[in-house]
């Protein structure tokens, strides 16, 4: 059984399309793992040296290349989800120089909610995605950037925060979701997994891809973040998923090939400007969107998620590259930097395009399509 | 809203020490705790410098220019950030800066430190 192609996306050049690439028994939960599969690595999994290798007026126009995915969200084959966690699963690592609870990490103890009660919030992020129970909402427009094709000079930092690499952005880049909803984008980080195991934060139908990019925006309504952090609609996340493809990523190597630099925890460098849109998928038009939380502490909620539909592709040795080069605390590899899929508790998720429309008719199971609050708007 | 201040600067004499502190107060919510923490200083026409950098699980990273003299700390009870600085040379005379890398960046005003004798 196969979630739908949508018969309107036009086809890109380049990597290999999900639909004929059913997901790997690796990839299907099973009962005495599903737990693991959903959730980042305790302090006792935490991979070692051993283990390897193994957030304008119109849209910026750029035109499809091979780097970009033919493999749409909605191509993907149906797999069970696995269950979602009653409790948030993450975990945080209490500092070995004492009690101090806010130096949180992935895996260990003691739980994220100790550290920031946010994190045990009923509208969490990140989640797991079925376009099947999407919302299909019309008043959902194509995202519009403006400013982000950056001059090589002022360079940018480039940073190894020990929990993931942060470009931070300067003044001037613009986004809007939509009339009277207009951000500024801050920076971009990435998630990712390890060798043979996938690292995205959002997952499809239960299906984790290899990696993801968060663009986080402030809304123009705020100066600040501080001010922002738990107001409806104060940040605003771009996702995308990264996903293997034949060919390298030419805006992502322009990161990539300075990630040496940076391997150990804690260290900087500085980069030249270049565009940010080309790290996006080039449709702005067709994403998923919902309202959550930042998926670090202090997870505070009312962040605007929207996921786009399309994929980034990257070669396998710029994925393995990202995977396999950063070091974060305590002498671990950086890897994993993925928090559990929280549960919806009600939320619908929203979708600018009929992700739960078949394009054929089917005899049976009738999808019961969840109906669009913003409809109207 | 979030503001940084620094103190603890001043006039030292060679081989002498200082440490500085960077206090931040007025965020409703405490991002202090979830902020990577920095000192960067900008000497006299020059550039802004980083120095030393602490992450939020306590990771600490020193330009090659003050390791083994200086030493980076933070004590999150307090939303306070430190500097001590031993061994200090007339080289190390700047503004001394304190950033909160938190989804963007919070600057104090900064602090002057001038090695003299």
């Known amino acids: 059984q196969r979630l739908p192609r949508m018969q309107e996306d036009s086809p890109l050049g380049g990597g290999s399309s999900g639909e004929d690439d059913p997901l790997g028994e690796e990839d299907l939960p099973s009962e005495e793992d599903s737990p693991r599969e959903e959730d980042p690595p305790g302090e006792e999994d935490l991979p070692g040296e051993e283990d390897l290798p193994g957030e304008e007026d119109l849209p910026e126009v750029k035109p499809k290349s091979e780097e970009e995915g033919s493999l749409k969200l909605e191509d993907l084959p149906t797999v069970e989800a696995p269950g979602d966690p009653q409790e948030p699963q993450n975990n945080a690592h209490r500092d070995k120089e004492g009690d101090d609870q806010s130096h949180w990490r992935y895996g260990g103890d003691p739980p994220w909610p100790r550290v920031s009660p946010a994190c045990a919030g009923r509208f969490q992020s990140p989640v797991d995605i079925r376009p099947q129970l999407a919302a299909f909402c019309p008043a959902l427009r194509p995202l519009e950037l403006l400013g982000f094709q950056l001059p090589p000079l002022p360079e940018l930092r480039l940073r190894n925060n020990g929990h993931s690499v942060q470009l931070t952005l300067p003044p001037g880049l613009e986004m809007a979701l939509g009339p009277g909803r207009e951000y500024r984008a801050l920076q971009l980080h990435l998630h990712w997994g390890a060798a043979g195991r996938p690292g995205s934060e959002h997952t499809v139908e239960g299906h984790r891809f290899p990696a993801e990019i968060h663009v986080v925006h402030l809304s123009t309504a705020f100066a600040r973040v501080d001010e922002a952090l738990g107001r409806p609609g104060g940040l605003a996340v771009l996702a995308a998923f990264l996903e293997e493809g034949p060919e390298e990523n030419s805006a992502y190597e322009q990161l990539l090939s300075r990630l040496e630099e940076i391997a150990e925890e804690g260290s900087e460098t500085q980069v030249p400007g270049l565009d940010i849109s080309a790290l996006l998928p080039s449709d702005f038009s067709r994403y998923f969107q919902y309202e959550g939380s930042l998926t670090t502490p202090p997870c505070a909620q009312g962040v605007i998620w929207t996921v786009f539909n399309q994929t980034v592709m990257l070669s396998a040795k710029q994925l393995h590259t990202l995977s396999d080069t950063l070091w974060g605390p305590g002498d671990s590899r950086l890897q994993l930097n993925f928090r559990a899929t929280q549960p919806l508790n009600g939320r619908v998720i929203e979708a600018s395009f009929p992700a739960g429309v078949d394009s054929s008719p089917r005899a049976a199971e009738p999808v019961q399509l969840n109906s669009c609050l913003a409809a109207g708007d | 809203e979030v503001q940084l201040l620094e103190s603890g600067g001043g006039l030292v004499q060679p081989g002498g020490s200082l440490r500085l502190s960077c206090a931040a107060s007025g965020n409703s919510v405490n991002i202090f705790s979830f902020a990577a923490m920095s000192w960067y200083r900008q000497a006299p026409g020059k550039g802004l410098e980083l120095v030393a950098v602490?992450?939020?699980?306590?990771?600490?990273k020193y330009s090659d220019s003050v390791k083994g003299r200086f030493t980076i700390s933070r004590d999150n009870s307090k939303n306070t950030l430190y500097l001590q600085m031993n061994s200090l040379r007339a080289e190390d005379t700047a503004v001394y800066y304190c950033?909160?890398?938190?989804?963007?960046?919070?600057w104090g005003q900064g602090t002057q430190v001038t090695v003299s004798s």
């Open positions: 602490i992450t939020t699980t306590g990771g600490t």
């Open positions: 950033n909160a890398d938190y989804l963007q960046d919070y």
